[in-house]
């Protein structure tokens, strides 16, 4: 339904508080380098303008699109050219090209300082002195570092952030109360950002059809009692929400997400028996809860899939009449019967089924041709099952840190051209699949592991896209969304790689390593491990293990020494020499 003023419509729907928060998120995700104060000023100007439109929708400029209004506002930033370089050229374009231009300049790895957590008392004072500014700063800092963060979900994180400070700043032991909560929010936030990044990549790189297929599979697993028509409606609505958020249309996205939560809760009897608790929660919690809700129980006595999709004489007729609807029904029926499969596996099966029908429905005897299509599924199912079994065994044998190291070596050998920080970050995250998924029973392992790996490999893909250095990474990332993980798994050692020149500086360590947290110390050691593999790609596991063990002993020894810096200088030289000898460098 058309509104005289889109900005007034969204302001009234969302309310002042959500409107201001979402505009701040949108601006921070576009102009990631701008100071906080500049963004607050822009947001206040937009808000005051929106209020004039609420008062009189016919007022000047109130009929303009949100992209026009927001883009015009962003283009008033004085230092656009100096700060952002060619992004300033976007301002010479007209909508919708200008917004597309801004979207293309979003930076997944912005050059921003690491967020350092101040002392608890300092944070509590800041919270009490100006709660509104404190919370706005949180939105701003997260949004600029995560330019695809799901905006309505960020409102939920901010609400929890506020609740943590409200509770803990009046606790007897503020730190004991607050720090675990902040750690949990940080970890959940990173995971949420990465999951949303995959949704946006799916929409932007592979199109709406790819996203809808993913959504059909996932919602059918989650709501197996829902009819196909109901799942299709939810998929359409969910696709609209995520298309909007990924496209920077955060006001529309948040509004539509709230509408979708309302619809789901009003129709939960025909969707899922697991929604009751979610639907009793406040709006932001409700939407989050619905997005994370456990799979409903499968209906009893579901008939065999073969009847409708293999044995029926009407398979080709039904397929020809409406290809995507028929394939959607296949995916729905298969997914609702298989909560034990990953979404990407279900999509591979659907693709195989589609390819078979394309070939067979043009054959002389179609039925004879596609009669054995389900047999083709067996190896596709077994491949991830076997991979997960092997890797969980390795994880249980090594523990998380050493499992990460095994993956670091594996992936550095596959794609040694990728930057060391990216290899460390991605391999550490790949390694977390062990503690995240291997504890689950067989029936939950594959959806947990393979769908998580899709999220992590997407991080590699988006980081690599910014500065492409490896044709193999580009190939695995762009050829097929659902086959990314098998593509990376299939990569062997890159024989074309010319080993990196040895640089002693890379392996020079100082006493500051002793004061680092355990996690930061691990990252230092893992960075050294990647560099070692880049220098000596043919090094054996045993050689690398020996060097890493020596390195760990060296750090431990020097951190206990009275004169730490001298120890690192002298023992470090010896370690480098011994390592070079051991690896034949």
């Amino acid at each position: 339904d058309a509104h005289k003023s889109e900005v007034a419509h969204r302001f009234k729907d969302l309310g002042e508080e959500n409107f201001k928060a979402l505009v701040l998120i949108a601006f921070a995700q576009y102009l990631q380098q701008c100071p906080f104060e500049d963004h607050v000023k822009l947001v206040n100007e937009v808000t005051e303008f929106a209020k004039t439109c609420v008062a009189d929708e016919s007022a000047e400029n109130c009929d303009k699109s949100l992209h026009t209004l927001f883009g015009d506002k962003l283009c008033t930033v004085a230092t656009l050219r100096e700060t952002y370089g060619e992004m300033a050229d976007c301002c010479a374009k007209q909508e919708p090209e200008r917004n597309e231009c801004f979207l293309q300049h979003k930076d997944d790895n912005p050059n921003l300082p690491r967020l350092v957590r101040p002392e608890v008392d300092v944070m509590c004072t800041a919270f009490h002195d100006n709660e509104e500014t404190f919370l706005k700063k949180y939105l701003y800092e997260i949004a600029r570092r995560h330019p695809y963060f799901y905006a309505p979900e960020l409102l939920f994180f901010a609400k929890r952030y506020k609740a943590a400070f409200t509770e803990c700043c009046q606790a007897a032991d503020k730190a004991a109360c607050l720090l675990p909560k902040l750690d949990e929010l940080r970890d959940e936030g990173k995971a949420s950002s990465a999951k949303q990044r995959l949704k946006c990549a799916s929409l932007q790189k592979f199109g709406e059809r790819a996203f809808k297929a993913w959504a059909v599979a996932r919602l059918s697993q989650r709501f197996p009692k829902a009819e196909f028509a109901e799942v299709s409606k939810l998929v359409t609505d969910l696709t609209k929400v995520h298309t909007e958020c990924c496209h920077g249309d955060l006001l529309e996205c948040a509004d539509d997400r709230a509408d979708l939560a309302k619809y789901i809760c009003e129709n939960q009897d025909s969707i899922s028996s697991k929604l009751k608790e979610c639907c009793e929660k406040p709006l932001l919690e409700k939407s989050h809860c619905i997005a994370e809700v456990e799979n409903d129980e499968m209906p009893a006595d579901l008939p065999s899939l073969a009847a409708d999709f293999v044995e029926s004489k009407d398979v080709c007729k039904n397929y020809a009449e409406a290809k995507d609807v028929f394939l959607g029904m296949f995916l729905y029926e298969y997914a609702r019967r298989h909560p034990d499969y990953s979404v990407v596996l279900l999509l591979r099966l659907a693709k195989t089924y589609e390819t078979t029908l394309e070939k067979c429905c043009a054959a002389a005897d179609p039925h004879e041709c596609y009669a054995k299509v389900f047999d083709e599924f067996k190896p596709l199912v077994e491949e991830p099952q076997n991979l997960i079994k092997q890797n969980c065994e390795l994880f249980e044998q090594l523990g998380e840190y050493k499992f990460q190291n095994a993956l670091l070596v594996r992936y550095t050998k596959k794609v040694p051209q990728v930057s060391t920080p990216t290899l460390v970050e991605v391999s550490r995250n790949l390694g977390k699949v062990g503690s995240k998924c291997c504890k689950h029973p067989e029936a939950k392992r594959m959806p947990c592991a393979e769908d998580y790996l899709s999220v992590v490999l997407n991080q590699l893909c988006v980081l690599h896209e910014k500065t492409p250095v490896s044709d193999r990474v580009t190939k695995c990332c762009t050829e097929s969304l659902v086959n990314r993980r098998p593509c990376f798994s299939a990569l062997e050692v890159d024989e074309t790689y010319v080993p990196k020149e040895f640089n002693a500086e890379t392996f020079t360590f100082h006493a500051d390593i002793c004061t680092l947290s355990e996690k930061e110390r691990q990252i230092k050691k893992q960075t050294a491990l990647v560099e070692l593999v880049k220098h000596k790609p043919k090094a054996t596991k045993e050689q690398l293990k020996a060097v890493m063990d020596d390195f760990a002993a060296f750090v431990e020894k020097c951190c206990k020494a009275d004169d730490k810096e001298t120890c690192f200088a002298e023992e470090g030289k010896k370690l480098v020499a011994a390592s070079q000898a051991a690896l034949g460098l």
Epitope: L14, G15, E17, N18, K51, L155, K159, A258, D259
Partner: nanobody, 122 residues
């Protein structure tokens, strides 16, 4: 969680005035946007007015604009609806609501009172 209790309803002649109050329990009242909705017999619940967390933004349904005023007193954990020049069509149960943002949409509010009856006779 916030508990909301409305009061001040009653029977009034057309053209008269009433002031509804909504008392909220809990220290976090000042963190919530507040609103009034109403429901006439056999009708859907409809938006009346909202006030932002800061109190700096208010918005009214066209049918009550210029006659009703919403206000809040954070020290007393109370939101008010001053209703002047009442009309028979204002007869309804009036509900107070609290949420994260000052929307005019019912589903954006998380906490609701039980309602207070307002009857305007002609």
């Amino acid at each position: 969680e916030v508990q909301l209790v409305e009061s001040g309803g009653g029977l009034v002649q057309a053209g008269g005035s009433l002031r509804l109050s909504c008392a909220a329990s809990g220290r976090t009242f000042s963190s919530y946007a507040m609103a009034w909705f109403r429901q006439a017999p056999g009708e859907e619940r409809e938006f009346v007015a909202t006030i932002s967390v800061s109190g700096g933004y208010t918005y009214y349904a066209d049918s009550v604009k210029g006659r009703f005023t919403i206000s809040r007193d954070n020290a007393k954990n109370t939101v008010y609806l001053q209703m002047n020049t009442l009309k028979p069509e204002d007869t309804a149960v009036y509900y107070c609501a609290a949420g994260d943002s000052s929307s005019w949409l019912e589903h954006m509010y998380d906490y609701w009172g039980q309602g207070t009856q307002v009857t305007v006779s002609s």
